[in-house]
């Protein structure tokens, strides 16, 4: 059984079948003798009880108030009352877009990653038994699909799949033809999944320096938005007043990832700064990656093969 209409604010398009189902339906069956009433109020008009005589377009079935179809003048507040139970809805009926097969206010947007599973299923459980046929349109052009009862698209997404998909259910009621439209705006995007962050450049870097001078060690990484990049050095970070971590710089790549750079500035280089590891680490949910810098005196350069040097 179709479950109840829980949302208190509802917007529908003129000319379509529509229903309100109260949320104490199971309870209502248990106390069938109880008086159950539907009311409408709009503007200055106070509560007016609804019954099939109110309008040829209105039908009452057990727990449901049906509109065949809903029209602009049905806008207003609706109430269901039974004993001490009341449920209220605010109904807003909007104009149909005459220039399109759907109304923009009634669109459900979904973003799907390319190559990921993508599906459109045209179903309407409440009106299922009354539906003669259902058509699926893409950007208001009918798609030729095998199943005309519940047309479905199930595939791995491609960029060409992007567009507005409208399921149009055609149904008969009291000799009249009606249709109900449900539209999805499907956007296909690049893979959004996280990358394994990587530090750029060699893992071990010897940097030639002169005592008393300054040096800037640049650590760069390609990472995800929530990943962090930091420096580790000495017994306790920050114990050397001559060592400063500069503010991290980040630039977003076209793929939606980040290029980050963090500089470690060492001023007035002393003997204590030589031949120790300055480690730069990038940390993510998937683990860490570290690269190391070692400061060596320019005079000692000859002892180290040229290919391990960084300026």
């Amino acid at each position: 059984a179709e479950s109840c209409t829980s949302r208190p604010h509802i917007t529908v398009v003129e000319g379509e079948p529509f229903y309100l189902k109260h949320c104490s339906c199971s309870l209502a069956h248990e106390i069938e003798t109880t008086t159950k009433s539907w009311y409408k109020s709009s503007g200055s008009q106070e509560h007016v009880e609804l019954n099939p005589r109110s309008s040829s377009r209105i039908a009452l079935h057990d727990c449901v108030l049906e509109f065949w179809p809903v029209e602009l003048n049905d806008t207003g507040s609706y109430f269901f009352q039974m004993k001490n139970y009341t449920q209220k809805w605010k109904l807003n009926v909007i104009r149909r877009n005459k220039h399109s097969c759907f109304t923009e206010r009634q669109v459900t947007s979904k973003i799907v990653e390319v190559k990921k599973f993508f599906q459109i299923t045209c179903e309407n459980s409440y009106y299922q038994t009354l539906v003669n046929s259902t058509s699926l349109y893409k950007n208001c052009k009918k798609l030729l699909l095998e199943n005309n009862k519940n047309p479905t698209i199930k595939k791995n997404a491609e960029f060409e799949d992007q567009g507005y998909y409208s399921c149009v259910h055609f149904l008969h009621h009291n000799g009249k033809l009606f249709n109900i439209t449900k539209t999805f705006n499907i956007t296909i995007v690049e893979d959004r999944s996280n990358i394994v962050p990587v530090l750029l450049g060699p893992k071990l870097n010897h940097v030639a320096v002169e005592l008393g001078k300054n040096v800037r060690l640049n650590c760069s990484a390609l990472l995800n938005e929530e990943d962090v990049i930091y420096w580790m050095f000495g017994e306790e970070n920050g114990s050397d007043p001559n060592i400063h971590e500069e503010k991290e710089m980040r630039i977003m790549t076209p793929e939606g990832k980040w290029h980050a750079s963090k500089v470690l500035r060492i001023e007035n280089i002393g003997e204590s700064n030589l031949n120790v590891l300055y480690n730069c680490t990038v940390a993510s949910t998937g683990g860490t990656d570290t690269k190391s810098f070692i400061l060596v005196r320019k005079a000692d350069m000859a002892d180290i093969p040229g290919h391990v040097f960084t300026r």
Partner: antibody, heavy 121, light 111 residues
Framework: QVQLVQSGAEVKKPGASVKVSCKAS????????MHWVRQAPGQGLEWMGT????????YYNQKFQGRATMTVDTSTSTVYMELSSLRSEDTAVYYC??????????????WGQGTTVTVSS | EIVLTQSPGTLSLSPGERATLSCRAS??????????MHWYQQKPGQAPRLLIY???NLETGIPDRFSGSGSGTDFTLTISRLEPEDFAVYYC?????????FGQGTKLEIK
């Protein structure tokens, strides 16, 4: 009338995972979208992602992509949010909340009571 | 991603005064006559509460001293005459596109 009831508070160690549940009562579960919003102590609201119970479609805030997983059990009208590789910054109150499925109706008129997740070693 | 910026960060007023809170979006959140901007109130230890939906519609049960206005990128929440229970944090939220997003909040405090 409409209620969202969340699971109880959790205390987790860094690196662990947490799974929070949210049970919906008395309403059209599959025609509404379910969302997760978190709030760190003294901070603002942060939208984590959403699930459409009708087809299990999910969309995550990029910040939580790959770390958050939202699932649904339509037989019990329950949605779940699992967050992995927890760190201290994930200490927050996690709310489930519901909206309509149309873009215009994706505002949150019903909220769960919140689940406090504390990440501490 | 649409970024929402609320101002001021904190607003100090007295009961009875008029409060005007602003929310600016990094791109338009309006389409076909509708503005997909919503406002919430949150008090300490409580879940947020919907006040205004679609820029100007008052949620059921919310006092009519609350009103919302604006379109495109600029939106305003107005409280015509502050009551003691109105002092709280207020958030705007957009639903024009995924990912959905909130503003950072405006704290309304008693002067």
């Amino acid at each position: 009338q409409v209620q969202l009831v969340q699971s109880g508070a959790e205390v987790k160690k860094p690196g662990a995972s947490v799974k929070v549940s949210c049970k919906a009562s008395d309403y059209t579960f599959t025609s509404n979208w379910m969302h997760w919003v978190r709030q760190a102590p003294g901070q603002g609201l942060e939208w984590m992602g959403t699930i459409d119970p009708s087809d299990s479609y999910t969309y995550y805030n990029q910040k939580f992509q790959g770390r958050a997983t939202m699932t649904v059990d339509t037989s019990t009208s329950t949605v779940y949010m699992e967050l992995s590789s927890l760190r201290s910054e994930d200490t927050a109150v996690y709310y489930c909340t519901t909206s309509g499925d149309y873009d215009a109706d994706r505002y949150f008129d019903v909220w769960g009571q919140g689940t406090t997740v504390t990440v501490s070693s | 991603e649409i970024v929402l910026t609320q101002s001021p960060g904190t607003l100090s007023l007295s009961p009875g005064e008029r409060a005007t809170l602003s929310c600016r979006a990094s791109k338009s959140v309006s389409t076909s006559g509708d503005s997909y901007m919503h406002w919430y109130q949150q008090k300490p230890g409580q879940a947020p509460r919907l006040l205004i939906y679609l820029a100007s519609n008052l949620e059921t049960g919310i006092p009519d001293r609350f009103s919302g206005s604006g379109s495109g990128t600029d939106f305003t929440l107005t409280i015509s005459r502050l009551e003691p229970e109105d002092f709280a944090v207020y958030y705007c939220q957009q639903s024009r596109e995924l990912p959905l997003s909130f503003g950072q909040g405006t704290k309304l405090e008693i002067k």
